[in-house]
């Protein structure tokens, strides 16, 4: 369906054309239940809550209402060359027995998440593949989406920015056909290879997918937990080699710096993930500059010269508010012969699942 927000002159400032599927987990008296439903064709723009943004104060937003009081909101923000859906939020009424039969609670729920929906200014965002936005207990999947904000006239621009999923990648297999209903579990982050070299050659080899789990207070004093995937295509890696400390520094999307520090126990000749440091920007947080660090971790351990490997997802708790979910990790620090992984030491999680 096509949704449009206009300014006082009648010129559109936001246009969006997409279909959406919702997957919602909720509680019933007989246990948890999952409902999937589509954005109905009679969904409408809430004109008095949608806005083109007021000069110097607020950003444009598109509020779509459907059913018995449910709303989907897309809140936009812009930079000099890019704009994005900074926040997607979904307000749903568990009292709607049509969508949520046997719900044990009748409350109004609000969930939200930052998104990967971004495009060049004066170009439309285009994504034929499903774009999934994961929120607490809810996944929204946009299909065949064309979205543009900060419009100059009441029509989509000629140029477009395609989503990652739509871009052909020579190194990856073709995408799997879309599943009938979106999964409420956040999709796994892409796995990428990282290496750090110094004067004596490679001191770190790592292959892993990274997901940040952040809990913070929003401007309206509510606390939210968000999962953010590190996108390898938008991440640059650097680092340093030392006799007692190896660092891997990841810069992602211009707003996130993630630092891994590997230490070595000389007496046992074992390396381990000793520290993680994060600096990122959370636009909707009460304090947008989010920082977390812990220098006394003991994770991803293996004998120097060997590699540590774990196919199971590993959760590394950094602080109360921040942990890193590491997927399909394979890492080796300090001593890397010939730029190749050495003998594998499997994690306990993998051994238990065999």
């Amino acid at each position: 369906a096509m949704f449009m927000v206009k300014n006082g002159n009648g010129t559109a400032c936001i246009m969006a054309n997409f279909s959406a599927a919702f997957s919602v987990n909720y509680d019933t008296k007989s246990g948890p239940k999952n409902m999937t439903f589509d954005l109905p064709s009679d969904a409408t723009v809430v004109l008095n809550r949608s806005s083109c943004g007021k000069e110097n104060t607020s950003d444009p937003s598109l509020v779509i209402a459907f059913g018995r009081g449910h709303t989907l909101t897309l809140q936009f923000t812009r930079q000099a060359t890019r704009y994005s859906v900074q926040l997607m939020s979904f307000v749903y009424q568990l009292s709607d027995t049509h969508l949520f039969p046997q719900a044990s609670s009748k409350e109004i729920k609000t969930v939200e998440s930052i998104t990967d929906i971004r495009a060049d200014i004066d170009k439309k965002y285009r994504c034929v593949s499903g774009t999934q936005v994961h929120m607490n207990q809810v996944t929204v999947t946009l299909h065949d989406a064309t979205i543009q904000a900060y419009l100059s006239q009441s029509s989509f621009s000629r140029g477009e920015t395609r989503c990652e999923q739509d871009r052909p990648s020579p190194t990856t297999a073709p995408p799997a056909p879309p599943s009938p209903s979106p999964s409420p579990v956040p999709k796994s982050p892409s796995v990428d290879k990282y290496n750090v070299s110094g004067t004596n050659g490679t001191c770190l080899l790592a292959s892993m997918g990274l997901q940040l789990n952040l809990t913070y207070e929003r401007k309206d004093n509510t606390t939210v937990t968000r999962l953010l995937n590190i996108n390898p295509n938008k991440t640059s890696a650097s680092g340093s080699c030392g006799a007692h400390l190896v660092t891997l520094e990841l810069h992602s999307e211009g707003t996130t710096v993630l630092l891994f520090q590997f230490g070595m126990n000389a007496s046992s000749s074992r390396f381990f993930l000793q520290g993680i440091q994060l600096n990122t920007i959370l636009p909707d947080a009460r304090d947008p500059a989010f920082k977390a660090a812990n220098g006394s971790l003991r994770a991803l351990q293996a004998t120097v010269g060997n590699s540590y490997k774990c196919n199971a997802e590993e959760h590394v708790r950094v602080t109360k508010a921040f942990s890193v979910n590491i997927f399909k990790v394979w890492v080796q620090a300090f001593k890397v012969e010939g730029g190749q992984f050495g003998s594998v030491e499997e994690c306990l999680l993998d051994e238990n699942s065999m």
């Epitope: 000069e55 110097n56 812009r78 930079q79 000099a80 060359t81 060049d120 200014i121 004066d122 900060y150 100059s152 006239q153 621009s157 000629r158 140029g159």
Partner: antibody, heavy 118, light 106 residues
Amino acid sequence: QVQLQQSGAELVKPGASVKMSCKASGYIFTNYNIHWVKKSPGQGLEWIGAIYPGNGDAPYSQKFKDKATLTADKSSSTTYMQLSRLTSEDSAVYYCVRANWDVAFAYWGQGTLVSVSA
Amino acid sequence: DIQMTQSPPSLSASLGGKVTITCKASQDIDRYMAWYQDKPGKGPRLLIHDTSTLQPGIPSRFSGSGSGRDYSFSISNLEPEDIATYYCLQYDNLWTFGGGTKLEIK
């Protein structure tokens, strides 16, 4: 109508800095990027950088990122460009420019002449 | 940054004649190409945007075409007031001018 009024000519010594201004009128200042362009006999037209006054985001050309600093003051609808560590190579006319959405650089200021001389 | 290679750097033509200037981008710029006229003592003037769309008030003697990485700009039926330096500008990814072409009349 859209107008961009630039500050007057500057004569500066090598090694010094200069800050020029560009006052915008006739439109909502925070809705459009303001760009800065250098025009010199040797190099022709060169894009220096742009600033989005809404939040101060400012991408620069690789060549000018250590030379120019762009700022904006929303209250006065004015954009500023500071050039540092000036040399004779920086002698040029500097224009502030506004794009007309996706119609490239449609509106130009009258230019500020900077002369660097000992 | 995208690089723009403009040629020729200068050219001379007769009144009433036709000239063509080309610009090659270092990558596909999706037709986000503009052409400017620059005269001494004046600010540059936008002639064409989006590769081939003439700005209001610009005579149809000026034209542009191209796609991908290769673009061209032509002036037919040359007049004395066309003496100027002409620049291409890509605005697909940040902004980059070509090196300019100085047009003289024989």
